[in-house]
């Protein structure tokens, strides 16, 4: 990785399958300093799950969260 991860939390892997939409309460993007772009979905149990922003289901979930 060209960037140090010491200074900002980064995702180094993405969840393989979609989470149930109902389990997600919010999202945020990891820092631009991270080598891998990622969306972090926060579940209702407060787990932070890394997802690939290029995946269709991820974009759909983001749109849904923005609308709600």
């Amino acid at each position: 990785s060209p960037y140090s991860s010491d200074t900002t939390p980064c995702c180094f892997a993405y969840i393989a399958r979609p989470l149930p939409r109902a389990h997600i309460k919010e999202y945020f993007y990891t820092s631009g300093k991270c080598s891998n772009p990622a969306v972090v979905f926060v579940t209702r149990k407060n787990r932070q799950v890394c997802a690939n922003p290029e995946k269709k289901w991820v974009r759909e979930y983001i749109n849904s969260l923005e609308m709600s």
Epitope: P9, F12, K45, N46, R47, Q48, V49
Partner: nanobody
Framework: EVQLVESGGGLVQAGGSLRLSCAAS????????MGWFRQAPGKEREFVAR????????YYADSMKGRFTISRDNAKNTVYLQMNSLKPEDTAVYYC?????????????????WGQGTQVTVSS
């Protein structure tokens, strides 16, 4: 059965150092982050640092940077926390934990497995 066993805690004077160890067994942890948390009496458990088991990528809580160093030895299935320039406010029970690699691994809720903890006491 997954087991995380911490050791290396104890009583140390302010300004001193300790190295905590966490021996992991019971599964393959290559797809996990290993993290250290601490909990002082009457306070919530707080994140200290985490390391990717296979990647070695690290992340530290802001307040720990510079004094604490997390590392791992894959051959020994052990994760370490080197703590230098210890202060009385570092007194706490220190816990080792494991989080799936697809999480950000910076909050307690990201972690699936926990050790029993090791007490660190820093006297002034």
């Amino acid at each position: 059965e997954v087991q995380l066993v911490e050791s290396g805690g104890g009583l140390v004077q302010a300004g001193g150092s300790l190295r905590l160890s966490c021996a992991a067994s019971g599964r393959t942890f290559s797809s996990y982050y290993m993290g250290w948390f601490r909990q002082a009496p009457g306070k919530e458990r707080e994140f200290v640092a985490r390391i990717g088991w296979s990647s070695g990528s690290t992340y530290y809580a802001d307040s720990m940077k510079g004094r604490f160093t997390i590392s791992r030895d894959n051959a020994k299935n052990t994760v370490y926390l080197q703590m230098n320039s210890l202060k009385p406010e570092d007194t706490a029970v220190y816990y080792c934990a494991a989080a799936p690699r697809y999480t950000l691994a910076t909050v307690t809720y990201d972690y699936d497995y926990w050790g029993q903890g090791t007490q660190v006491t820093v006297s002034s």
